[in-house]
Interface confidence: low
């Protein structure tokens, strides 16, 4: 809920890459007694869906009639703050994030509905909403207290890899079983048959009446 009244053309924001033991919470957790500039509100806790989607509202009390607003989502975890996504929009227009952004959002008056996608358990952390009134001057900055987003990886139901292994094992077992069965059956069949003579097929006398001509095969051995 930080507020800043620097004019836009008289200030520059620098998000330092270094981190300090004294975290951003020192900066965020004090009650804004003299805050006449801008107040940003966001829910304290949000639980992400099983599909890794979390939505929350970021609401700011605009001290003036801003026409250009920039919204940034920051993530704080283990005293490190990283920018998750950012979007600039004109009041009354859609909130447009970059194509490759994991964020989507819609704006309605002084409210911004933010949705963060593709979250995993490791992404659990404090997600801070930062709102900047870019135009017209003066420039204002508001920083929310942050929304603690909890992400729980869904339980495997059951593990698809495990299922594949079972399927592979069963398939292999059935294949070898059928192969073995076929082999055994063939060997039994072959044992039952009389031994074959190698050499000449003898021309057999006709067993049927002469009228029904039947041609017997000849086997010509190759020396």
């Amino acid at each position: 809920m930080a507020c800043l009244g620097f004019q836009r053309h008289k200030a520059q924001l620098n998000l330092a890459t270094r981190t300090w033991p004294c975290t951003l919470l020192f900066f965020l957790l004090f009650i804004p007694v003299f805050c006449k500039a801008m107040h940003v509100a966001q829910p304290a806790v949000v639980l992400a869906s099983s599909r890794g989607i979390a939505s929350f509202v970021c609401e700011y009390a605009s001290p003036g009639k801003a026409t250009e607003v920039r919204v940034t989502v920051l993530r704080q975890a283990d005293s490190q703050v990283t920018e998750v996504c950012a979007a600039t929009y004109m009041m009354g227009n859609e909130l447009t994030f970059l194509d490759d952004s994991i964020c989507t959002g819609t704006s309605s008056g002084n409210q911004v509905n933010l949705t963060i996608q593709g979250l995993r358990a490791m992404d659990t952390g404090l997600y801070i909403c930062k709102v900047e009134l870019m135009y017209p001057p003066p420039y204002y900055l508001g920083i929310g207290n942050g929304t603690q987003i909890y992400v729980i990886d869904p339980e495997p139901c059951p593990d698809s890899d495990f299922l594949l292994w079972i399927l592979a094992a069963v398939s292999s077992g059935l294949f070898f079983y059928s192969f073995l069965l076929t082999a055994v059956s063939l060997s039994k069949m072959l044992k039952k048959r009389s031994p074959l003579t190698t050499g000449v097929y003898v021309k057999m006398p006709p067993t049927e009446p002469e009228c029904e001509k039947q041609f017997q095969p000849y086997f010509i051995p190759i020396n």
Partner: nanobody
Framework: QVQLQESGGGSVQAGGSLRLSCAPS??????MGWFRQAPGKEREGVAV????????YYADSVKGRFTISQDTAKNTIYLQMNSMKPEDTAMYYC???????????????????WGQGTQVTVSS
């Protein structure tokens, strides 16, 4: 009551450098920074640093020349002033806002605590 003690002021030639220090007597809260007031002019914000050190703000007139930093172990903030100009001549005040959240280059009322100031003179 938080006491802010500035040091490092003095005279310097244009293009020179100075380093101001400010050590609060105890924890000073959300943010600390520097304001300055030139003779016959209003006080203006120079630079601000959040207590975490993650965020800094600079007035356009000093951007790229001044650097605000802090040493959390010593509980001290610094203003490194390089490439100084005659228009940087002013009384420099260390400020702290333990609870206040409205800080403005034009409106210094958001700062609860002010130092006595240290004079900086830049001659051409």
């Amino acid at each position: 009551q938080v006491q802010l003690q500035e040091s490092g002021g003095g005279s310097v030639q244009a293009g020179g450098s100075l380093r101001l220090s400010c050590a609060p007597s105890r924890y000073s809260g959300a943010l600390m920074g520097w304001f300055r007031q030139a003779p016959g002019k209003e006080r203006e914000g120079v630079a601000v640093i959040s207590r975490s050190g993650l965020t800094t703000y600079y007035a356009d007139s000093v951007k790229g020349r001044f650097t605000i930093s802090q040493d959390t172990a010593k509980n001290t903030i610094y203003l490194q002033m390089n490439s100084m100009k005659p228009e940087d001549t002013a009384m420099y005040y260390c400020v702290a806002a333990p609870e206040a959240r409205a800080w403005s280059s034009r409106d210094p009322t958001g700062y609860n605590y002010w130092g006595q100031g240290t004079q900086v003179t830049v001659s051409s």
